[in-house]
Interface confidence: low
């Protein structure tokens, strides 16, 4: 290889070893017979060399810095060429570096030839191997403007007071252009400006200087967005860190054309503006840090450029205003990531502040449209407390757990509505009576309905899940002993249609001792499945549950046990089981940590089955599930 | 280097807490996925928990949904894992792992045991 | 929740021989299979990732493959310190992951 570099050319080549690998052989650069693992050549040097192995590639590399001195003379502007041309270099990994200083009064503006630029941060890398890194300087200090690739949508770079650009090139690559050209400008008054052009829909992600290091200290930076008019950009922070701040606030402004109030100033953790339509500006402002403890600002974003969707001039006006206690938050479902381009899913309140999710409380009324390309990515969560503090103006109030109809005219569904019913610890109990009796969920008899009710403990300390009920069984109320939550979950898009079938009594009662009673009257038709609660993880330590079985006059209940026995084990206490006749109080007691569950038994009259657990030992717990069938009586008994 | 390091394993009683910590060098935990896998004793990989702090992405297990709580500290570049109401069948080699590829990059592993 | 059969639970070889395991996913998973090794008293390592890309530093003796919802680890060429518990692993939903229930490749 030969390289000669002209006496004015103001370039200099080093070779050198690259990041260290684990090769068997190692190489050397050969000039004259002597080997070096280094070899450096100013302006006005010629040098012949080779190297001691086949594939140089895997042991060196190849910088060619170009210093541009524009404070002494004319600034060569115009489009950058590769000198030493490509061709001329031996096939190492190359870096070619320009490093232009200017005064400060003067803007210089790199301007990228289409393929544009795309930014890329920390762990990441670009798929050809080329990439662009940018710094600008502040007096003497380099700041990073940042990493980028090809096939963006980064069009121009406007600093001041000089800049330093490295274009990297794996040493595979045939390019031989540059793909840049530098103009001058007049003083932009900030660190720089990023201008990023989008010819269609599509997303960039951008970061402040020096990111993930800290923004430079009372700084300005500025994007500026050039978007398509019949397209909408939203913008949301990725991440972000604040400083510790003296003077002035950190902040983010937006120059938005069109809009009354400019420019827009908000704080990194507001939400960000969402759904603008037309060309728009950001700019980033540090402030003066503390001293003693600066901190570090920086801040990562994503701009999402995107057609309108037919939704996204629909404002939905959602009037919490007559609710208490509620909270309504509209999420993406859980779904897996795609890789390629995915348009935002945005719901937006008063169609400004635009976020992947929102939440909506009680109090007010919220008008909210959605940006969004498919409105099934997004669901609906409700919250809604009823609690009683004083148990003599609770006691036999009732309350209709129902979602209330203006949900149903949101374009999103409805995934959870839950009601937590808080009581008076000791002082009263709580009844859910369905509007159409209840099935309980079993692996032996599944719910098909677009809807379940999820019945369990609202007490932190305890584990404690009733289980899963639909409409369309033989449960008729459900009493439980103190504070649950009742969440109404959602299977289909068919519960808009099953929405009438929805509809529970809540009602303060005395309190009562038991953890739950539920009142049954079976069906003619069909087996009733019950369970204990807690299934597959055990009725907790000394909880006890009772079932009352109604028996129509015509009918004989069978009740069947599920296993022979319980499998449970007591540390301490008693498992044990009564089944009570209600007509005679006549009552059997079984040990159900001792005995065989009882064989299949007839009932002619109505009878309760109480369970009452002790403390079971770990991995043996209590787990029962039974069922009834009703047929008629051939000889009256009575 | 990258190197992933947890801590906080121990004997723990039934409905006991512990927390685990992973902390992370030679890469920033905002950027991955970060999870905790267990293995009990003479038994296979179950995945427990995942989170991507950078977007406040949380999922877990059917088995210790409710129980157990994920979350980082990137300004400490830790992941860590709140197990509370603890059972026997948490008794596990407690790993925590960086995702990329697959799990590309895993801890030594923190016992928990649960008993009485 | 996608369930991964791995076969088989474990199997006897020799240095030298080719072994084959096996990973069925009970739905469609892309490509989105990885393969582990694992010692005992180690965590895993990865082998393989997107069903068939090497991962970095593996030896080349390892391969995968994938056939609709089959997928295979080879192993061309057992070596000494190739003895250990393999284990796929699915991630096409992204949640819960799930593992199939381990191969152990013993000495014949």
């Known amino acids: 290889f030969e390289i000669a570099l002209p006496r004015e050319s103001n370039i200099t080549v080093l070779i050198k070893l690259g990041t260290p690998t684990l090769l068997a052989k190692p190489c050397y650069i050969v000039i004259s017979k002597r080997h070096t693992t280094m070899l450096s050549i100013k302006p006005g040097e010629r040098i012949l060399f080779t190297f001691s192995c086949q594939s140089p590639e895997n042991h060196f590399v190849i910088e060619i810095q170009k210093n541009i001195d524009c404070m002494s003379g004319p600034c060569p502007f115009g489009e950058v060429q590769l000198q030493p041309s490509t061709s001329l270099l031996p096939t190492l990994n190359r870096t070619f570096i320009w490093d232009v200083k200017a005064h400060k009064s003067i803007g210089l503006e790199l301007q990228f030839s289409i393929p544009r630029l795309r930014q890329f941060g920390p762990g990441e890398s670009c798929p050809d191997g080329v990439t662009y890194s940018i710094s600008g300087r502040i007096d003497a200090t380099v700041v990073r403007i940042g990493t980028f690739c090809s096939n963006g949508t980064v069009s121009r770079i406007k600093m001041q007071e000089g800049v330093k650009m490295a274009l990297h090139l794996p040493w595979f690559h045939p390019r031989n252009v540059s793909g840049f050209s530098i103009a001058n400008r007049s003083s932009i008054k900030r660190l720089c400006i990023i201008e990023s052009v989008f010819e269609g829909e599509g997303s960039a992600t951008l970061m402040s200087a020096n990111y993930p290091e800290g923004f430079p200290e009372d700084e300005l930076m500025t994007w500026q967005f050039v978007i398509p008019a019949h397209l909408r950009a939203s913008v949301s922070f990725l991440n972000f860190n604040l400083s510790n701040c003296e003077r002035k606030e950190e902040r983010v402004e937006y120059y938005i054309p069109g809009s009354t109030t400019n420019p827009e100033v908000f704080k990194l953790e507001d939400k960000q503006p969402g759904n603008m339509a037309g060309n728009f500006n950001l700019s980033l402002q540090g402030c003066d840090q503390d001293a003693q403890n600066p901190g570090i600002l920086r801040l990562q974003f994503q701009v999402l450029v995107q057609h309108p969707q037919n939704e996204s001039n629909k404002i939905y006006v959602v009037d919490l205003s007559n609710e208490r206690a509620t909270s309504l938050t509209i999420e993406p479902r859980p779904v897996k990531q795609s890789r390629k381009f995915v348009p935002g899913c945005f719901v937006c309140l008063e169609s400004r502040t635009c976020s992947t999710n929102l939440t909506l409380t009680s109090g007010s009324k919220h008008k909210i449209s959605f940006l969004c390309d498919n409105l099934t990515r997004l669901w609906m969560n409700v919250e809604k407390n009823i609690s009683c503090t004083d148990h003599r103006y609770c006691q036999r109030k009732s309350y209709s757990l129902q979602v209330p109809s203006d949900i149903f005219h949101l374009p999103v569904e409805l995934h959870d509505f839950s009601w937590k019913l808080l009581v008076p610890k000791d002082r009263l109990s709580l009844v859910l009576v369905p509007a159409q009796k209840l099935q309980q969920h079993t692996h032996e008899k599944p719910c098909n309905t677009s809807f379940s009710y999820l019945v369990a403990s609202a007490i932190p300390s305890q584990d404690l899940y009733f289980g899963s009920f639909c409409p369309g069984g033989s449960i008729e109320q459900i009493q439980v002993k103190q504070n649950i939550s009742v969440t109404l979950r959602t299977f289909a898009p068919s519960f808009r249609q099953e929405a009438s079938r929805q509809g529970l009594t809540v009602s303060f009662i005395p309190y009562f001792k038991e953890e739950g009673v539920f009142t049954v009257t079976p069906d003619t038709k069909s087996k009733v499945y019950l369970r204990t609660p807690n299934w597959d993880r055990g009725l907790p330590s000394l909880t006890s549950v009772s079932w009352n079985i109604s028996v129509p006059r015509d009918q004989v209940a069978c009740l069947t046990f599920f296993k022979e026995r319980t499998g449970v084990v007591c540390q301490t206490g008693r498992a044990f089981m009564i089944i009570q006749e209600q007509r005679t109080r006549a009552e059997e007691i079984f040990s159900l940590d001792e005995d065989a569950l009882p064989k299949p038994r007839f009932h002619h009259h109505s009878f309760w089955v109480n369970i009452s657990n002790c403390s079971p030992a770990s991995g043996k717990q209590l787990d029962l599930l039974f069922w009834v069938t009703l047929t008629p009586r051939t000889v009256d008994l009575t | 280097e990258v190197q992933l390091v947890e801590s906080g394993g121990g004997l723990v009683q039934p409905g006991g807490s512990l927390r685990l910590s992973c902390a992370a060098s030679g890469f920033n935990i905002s950027y991955y996925y970060m999870h905790w896998v267990r293995q009990a004793p003479g038994k296979g990989l179950e995945w427990v928990a995942s989170?991507?702090?950078?977007?406040?992405?949380?999922s877990y297990a059917d088995s210790v949904k409710g129980r157990f709580t994920i979350s980082a500290d990137t300004s400490k570049n830790t992941a860590y894992l709140q197990m509370n109401s603890l059972r026997a069948e948490d008794t596990a080699v407690y790993y925590c792992?960086?995702?990329?590829?697959?799990?590309?990059?895993w801890g030594q592993g923190t016992l928990v045991t649960v008993s009485s | 929740d996608i369930q991964m059969t791995q076969s088989p639970s474990s199997l006897s070889a020799s240095v030298g021989d080719r072994v084959t395991i096996t990973c069925r996913a009970s739905?469609?998973?892309?490509?989105?299979v990885a393969w582990y090794q694992q010692k005992p008293g180690k965590a895993p390592k990865l082998l393989i990732y997107?069903?068939?890309s090497l991962y970095s530093g593996v030896p080349s003796r390892f391969s995968g493959s994938r056939s609709g919802t089959d997928f295979t680890l080879t192993i061309s060429s057992l070596q000494p310190e190739d003895f250990a518990t393999y284990y796929c692993?699915?991630?096409?939903?992204?949640?819960?992951?799930?593992f199939g229930q381990g191969t152990k490749v013993e000495i014949k």
């Open positions: 997107s069903a068939s």
């Open positions: 739905q469609s998973v892309s490509s989105a």
């Open positions: 692993q699915q991630s096409y939903y992204v949640y819960p992951i799930t």
């Open positions: 792992a960086r995702v990329y590829y697959g799990f590309d990059y």
């Open positions: 989170i991507y702090s950078s977007y406040g992405y949380t």
